[in-house]
């Protein structure tokens, strides 16, 4: 039975230009994380292996970087970058759990309402 | 000015599809979100998912996964819920809204369009 | 899902009242970098929603300054200074932090 959670950072509005830290956890279980997958839509971004490491693909390595822990740092956001990214936590022996972050990326002109921009 | 004019209502029968469109004017159309709201019974209201036109991103709420999807024709600055399998218990209002950016919320609705699902 | 506990169900007033409505969530509605989104809406008969406050705390444009919204973490509140009858209707809260977004389960302002 799957009694683990998965609790995110929470949805995120950033700023075009700016970086952003993308963070999943996995609680309330025992079972053992193998691999984490972080995924936008139906693209892979970044997998990170309990035995071999991070492994960032190809189109992503010049904006993605591994970390911290089993999170996932965004650089040099455009606003093609909005949208659903998705942390995949695979595990033994209870599966998978998934956990779900929309980012908004706005142009770096647009403060409206006064909204705190989030850039680390 | 804002204005989001959704579709008409509707009259289905159980197992047909459906799709309502939502036009927007008056704002930069691919630049905020486009989100859809079910109201049944007259009180409750569920969050169906959003899409953001500028690269047709979505977000569904799990419940309405495989129930609803959301597409955009950006050339007439539409966006469009289909709903799939209709059964009575689809038979609500369903709202379009626009986005409000940086704060996920909704700041503009369109009038809503009635939906029901009888043989 | 985050459950969003609107209290209370109905709320019977007289014109000129002073009313709270909470809206309580499951979990902190505070995101990693410190925003809470979390937002109040007003339904009336035959209209569409419209929006109150968002962020917790900032008024939409056009909303009267009779209505103000306060809060953090898990626990929100919208205050109602002065009712007028244009006031009267069904108000949601709206957490906008977690996927998927969740609404309360409404509050019916309604004259005594």
């Known amino acids: 039975m799957m009694t683990g959670t998965i609790e995110t950072t929470g949805n995120i509005s950033a700023e075009k230009g700016g970086s952003i830290i993308l963070q999943c956890h996995l609680s309330s279980t025992t079972a053992q994380v193998t691999q984490v997958n972080w995924e936008q839509q139906d693209q892979l971004l970044a997998i990170c292996n309990a035995d071999l490491g991070w492994h960032i693909s190809p189109s992503f390595k010049d904006r993605v970087a591994p970390g911290p822990g089993l999170g996932l740092t965004l650089q040099s956001l455009t606003v093609n970058d909005t949208g659903e990214y998705f942390c995949i936590y695979h595990t033994y022996p209870d599966g998978t759990y998934t956990g779900r972050i929309f980012l908004e990326v706005l142009e770096s002109s647009v403060a409206e309402h006064g909204a705190r921009f989030q850039i680390p | 000015e804002v204005q989001l004019q959704q579709s008409g209502p509707e009259l289905v029968k159980p197992g047909a599809s459906l799709k309502i469109s939502c036009k927007a004017s008056g704002y930069s159309f691919t630049g905020y979100t486009m989100n859809w709201v079910k109201q049944s019974h007259g009180k409750n209201l569920e969050w169906i998912g959003l899409i953001f036109p500028y690269n047709g991103a979505t977000s569904y709420n799990q419940k309405f996964q495989g129930k609803a999807t959301l597409t955009v024709d950006k050339s007439s600055n539409t966006t469009y819920m289909e709903l799939l399998s209709l059964t009575s218990e689809d038979s609500a209002v369903y709202y379009c809204?626009?986005?409000?950016?940086?704060?996920?919320?909704?700041?503009?609705w369109g009038q809503g369009t009635s939906v029901t699902v009888s043989s | 899902d985050v459950v969003v506990t609107q209290t209370p169900l109905s709320l019977p007033v007289s014109f000129g009242d002073q009313v709270s409505i909470s809206c309580r969530s499951s979990?902190?509605?505070?995101?990693?970098?410190?925003?809470?989104?979390l937002s109040w809406y007003l339904h009336k008969p035959g209209q569409s929603p419209q929006l109150l406050i968002y962020?917790?705390?900032n008024r939409f444009s056009g909303v009267p300054d009779r209505f103000s919204g306060s809060g953090s973490g898990t626990d929100f509140t919208l205050k109602i200074s002065t009712i007028k009858p244009e006031d009267l209707g069904m108000y949601y809260c709206l957490q906008g932090t977690h996927q998927p977004w969740t609404f309360g389960g409404g509050t019916k302002l309604e004259i005594k």
């Open positions: 809204a626009r986005g409000l950016r940086g704060y996920f919320a909704m700041d503009y």
């Open positions: 979990q902190s509605l505070a995101n990693s970098y410190g925003n809470t989104y």
């Open positions: 962020g917790i705390s």
